[in-house]
């Protein structure tokens, strides 16, 4: 039940965090005017990924694309592939959780598979996240350069325009969204993870059992070797126990009702 | 068609009040910033006060900080102007106008109301 | 405060001829994040309210003559009207409206020559 529990949680805040690192790629407030200077501006300039903003006053918004790939800052297009593998990662990453979930019965899914993709996910959405952070704290540096450069002339480092001491950039909203989003996809990650341990079954450590088959006599002795049957070289009948240790054959055959204890 | 209409100006003794309305029609009034204008006998423009749509943001002029107070009622379509310790200087022709354009341009502008400050 | 100072006080011109109004600005107008001048243009004619005739220190308002047109960029701006015509008879005022308090120039009066 702990395992569920810990399996749906971790689900939920993944999916939650996810949605947080959308929200914050598609926001236009990764960067803000600083009002510090000039507090009383009737014009207030806001960037983000994909386009700059200007707010006026009379409440027009006019918002202009960087319609430049090349033009770009190389950081600018670092942060945007670091934010485009966390979403991507992340969405792959819920598509095989929910098929992992073990409240969800699809087929004849084994629990190791599910623990298999439980475990899957969770290490996608731990990627996600950390991609997300890595790309606001990317970001984040970056403004903080620009912030102190006092030239005349600075480039932005956004949209490949030169900028005046007359207008200086801070964090933006996106920038706490995205931090917050990692920080949760990343949990939602390890909770997963955790989840799979206890969704893995625990494997029989066979050491020493013997018992009777129907018209036959098998013996198995301790160690990992292979029981004869008395049926000749058949080499289908031939196992290996060894602490749950497997032969290909094994993998591939069904089990019968002789081949476990 | 917007219209902007002025009232509540007059004869006023210097260090009394008076208070100013503008009643907004033809547009939506509480999506857009409003500003207040004024022109003394001969002279030019002059700026008075700007409040945001939703009255977060209020600005003043240096010469009437403090004394003037501007406020809004959405609901009514109409904004307000307080003016209290009234000098001979604010006399003047008060205009509110809206920054209903690009550019933060003051593009509608009422006729206007008389503010007389005599003893 | 930005002080914006209109040259020349009055001006005098021939019609069909040109008229040139200028505004200086103590401070910068240009706003780095859309690359536009925060200077407006208005002319009031006698016994009228203001009008707005340019906005983005360039851009002229729809419905206004294409005799009227603003440049300039910074500190420095200009108002030409390329061919004044009687009805062009009027103060014309710059504003900043980059940055509060938004303060006017002191206008210039044009006139018939």
């Known amino acids: 039940m702990a395992v569920t529990a810990c399996q749906g949680l971790g689900f939920v805040v993944s999916l939650i965090g996810i949605a947080g690192i959308i929200a914050a790629t598609c926001m236009d407030q990764w960067s803000t005017q600083d009002l510090y200077n000039n507090p009383v501006t009737a014009v207030f300039n806001y960037q983000g990924l994909w386009r700059s903003c200007v707010r006026e006053s009379s409440g027009f918004t006019e918002c202009r694309g960087y319609f430049t790939l090349l033009g770009l800052p190389a950081m600018l297009q670092a942060v945007r592939a670091l934010m485009i593998v966390g979403i991507v990662l992340g969405a792959i990453g819920l598509l095989v959780s929910i098929f992992a979930l073990k409240c969800i019965r699809i087929g004849s899914m084994e629990d190791s598979a599910k623990a298999n993709m439980t475990l899957t996910s969770g290490i996608m959405f731990i990627v996600s996240g950390l991609c997300a952070i890595a790309g606001v704290s990317v970001f984040a540096n970056m403004l903080v350069t620009n912030f102190w450069m006092s030239t005349a002339n600075m480039y932005t480092g956004m949209g490949g325009m030169v900028q005046t001491v007359q207008t200086r950039y801070t964090f933006g909203a996106a920038l706490f969204v995205g931090w917050v989003a990692g920080g949760l996809t990343l949990i939602g990650g390890v909770m997963m993870c955790i989840a799979c341990r206890g969704l893995a079954p625990e494997e029989t450590n066979y050491k020493a059992v013997s018992y009777h088959a129907s018209g036959h006599s098998v013996a198995y002795k301790p160690g990992g070797f292979k029981a004869s049957t008395g049926f000749g070289s058949n080499t289908k009948n031939k196992k290996i126990y060894d602490g749950g240790a497997r032969t290909e054959d094994e993998v591939q055959s069904y089990p019968s009702k002789h081949d476990y204890v | 068609d917007v219209q902007l209409v002025e009232s509540g100006g007059g004869l006023v003794q210097p260090g009394g009040s008076l208070r100013l309305s503008c009643a907004a029609s033809?547009?939506?009034?509480?999506?857009?910033?409003m500003h207040w204008v004024r022109q003394a006998p001969g002279k030019g423009l002059e700026w008075v006060a700007y409040?945001?749509?939703?009255?977060?943001?209020?600005y003043y002029a240096d010469t009437v900080k403090g004394r003037f107070t501007l406020s809004r009622d959405n609901p009514k379509n109409t904004l307000y102007l307080q003016m209290n310790s009234l000098r001979a200087e604010d006399t003047a022709v008060y205009y509110c106008?809206?920054?209903?354009?690009?550019?933060?341009?003051?593009?509608?502008w009422g006729q206007g109301t008389t503010v007389t400050v005599s003893s | 405060d930005v002080v914006l100072t209109q040259s020349p006080d009055s001006l005098a011109v021939s019609l069909g001829e040109r008229a040139t109004i200028n505004c200086k600005s103590s401070?910068?107008?240009?706003?780095?994040?859309?690359?536009?001048?925060?200077l407006t243009w208005y002319q009031q004619k006698p016994g009228q309210t203001p009008k707005l005739l340019i906005y983005?220190?360039?851009t002229r308002k729809s419905g206004v003559p294409d005799r009227f047109s603003g440049s300039g960029s910074g500190t420095d701006f200009t108002l030409t009207i390329s061919s004044l015509q009687a009805e062009d008879v009027a103060v014309y005022y710059c504003?900043?409206?980059?940055?509060?308090?938004?303060?006017f120039g002191g206008g210039t009066k044009v006139e018939i020559k």
């Open positions: 106008a809206t920054s209903y354009y690009y550019g933060n341009a003051l593009e509608y």
């Open positions: 033809g547009f939506t009034f509480s999506s857009f910033g």
């Open positions: 409040i945001s749509s939703g009255s977060g943001s209020i």
């Open positions: 401070q910068s107008l240009f706003n780095v994040g859309n690359q536009k001048n925060y």
């Open positions: 983005w220190a360039s």
């Open positions: 504003q900043n409206v980059y940055s509060y308090p938004l303060t």
